[in-house]
Interface confidence: low
Amino acid sequence: SLGSLAAAEPAVIAECKTRTEVFQISRNLIDRTNANFLVWPPCVEVQRCSGCCNNRNVQCRASQVQMRPVQVRKIEIVRKKPVFKKATVTLEDHLACKCETVVTPRPVT
Amino acid sequence: SLGSLAAAEPAVIAECKTRTEVFQISRNLIDRTNANFLVWPPCVEVQRCSGCCNNRNVQCRASQVQMRPVQVRKIEIVRKKPVFKKATVTLEDHLACKCETVVTPRPVT
């Protein structure tokens, strides 16, 4: 909101770089055919590019990515009892970022 | 995806805590009546609660927040020339988080 400038520090741009984000492990990453299970943990940390670039024609994008397999628990409920199984979910970490020109398609004339 | 567990580390829960996020400073935070200006910087870092809790009945919520005024530039375009003005945007930082019970209304019987 607009207001008094007293005690207001100059805003600093959130530069384009990797930051820690939370990734929700959805059940359909594990098994699309069955809904009768839980996944543990439900979310994990990943590294993702975020932030702003100097103008609107460029966007902060990952210039280097790495796939990271992690082991999760698939907890199936069988006769009201938990049966623990294992599954691997492959996470995508961003290792480096850059401000990349956004190519917008020209309208056909 | 289900797959080989070779080289897969056990997934670690993204605990409920503050993390650095990027907040886009939208123009209508500065001036709802006029669209003929730019804001600098277009985004800043804020601290926000994120992550998962031990079960689905609780959610990661901020238990302590702090409002932080920051000074931004409002760049109006007047006769194709930039006119620099100042404005204050108040950001909300989360200082502490907790896993809070989600109260879901019971169905009326």
Epitope: K80 | L5, P10, N54, N55, N57
Partner: antibody, heavy 120, light 107 residues
């Protein structure tokens, strides 16, 4: 400081009943799964039962299924084990233990235990 | 049910010794293995969870390793207060089961 204090143990005849209690303090009891683990004299550890944080899910060892009932009262920070149709082989020290989140299935903090003796 | 087999059932060691206790599961349990220490007349205490994660407040001379069916608890330099019985426990599936225990005695 986390504290778990069991009570209710004692001498009971075969076929009799006992109700064990566990008073919890020093942590948010309602957020944690809880368990009972027992240890017969000079023997190893045996898992007995586990209950979910809200109390809606309960799990039992086959050796006690149908005879023992685990329950909790989150308003009172208390865990219970109702033991019916007791047998000589149920003689043991019974420990209550905090079992973490909903799939941790470990025993993080333990009480000091309460001795149950089933004998005629 | 998953059977957990510990070896040895007892061992004698001196202060300063490196001690290794093994635990074998009857089927693969990934890294869902926990270790406990119990002293006479006392409740057990969690030392290691998820095969290799040290519980808060546990001295760093304790370490755990292994995955699948074979696991190890190592005490790098045995201290007087470490003479106790150690149990492994699988948290892979119910019923939750413990190993038979390993008693570490003073030589």
């Amino acid at each position: 400081e986390v504290q778990l204090v069991e009570s209710g143990g004692g001498l009971v005849q075969p076929g009799g009943s006992l109700r064990l209690s566990c008073a919890a303090s020093g942590f948010t009891f309602s957020s944690y799964w809880m368990s009972w683990v027992r240890q017969a004299p000079e023997k190893g550890l045996e898992w007995v039962s586990t209950i979910s944080d809200g109390g809606g899910l309960t799990y039992y060892a086959d050796s006690v299924k149908g005879r023992f009932t685990i329950s909790r009262d989150n308003a009172k920070n208390s865990l219970y084990l109702q033991m019916n149709s007791l047998r000589a082989e149920d003689t043991a020290v019974y420990y209550c233990a905090e079992s973490g989140g909903y799939t941790d299935w470990l025993f993080g903090y333990w009480g000091q235990g309460t001795l149950v003796t089933v004998s005629s | 049910d998953i059977q957990m087999t510990q070896s040895p059932s007892s061992l004698s060691a001196s202060v300063g010794d490196r001690v290794t206790i093994t635990c074998r599961a009857s089927q693969s349990i990934s890294s869902y293995l926990n270790w406990y220490q119990q002293k006479p007349g006392k409740a057990p205490k969690l030392l290691i969870y998820a095969a290799s994660s040290l519980q808060s407040g546990v001295p760093s001379r304790f370490s755990g390793s292994g995955s699948g069916t074979d696991f190890t608890l190592t005490i790098s330099s045995l201290q007087p207060e470490d003479f106790a019985t150690y149990y492994c426990q699988q948290s892979y599936s119910t019923p939750l089961t413990f190993g038979g225990g390993t008693k570490v005695e003073i030589k």
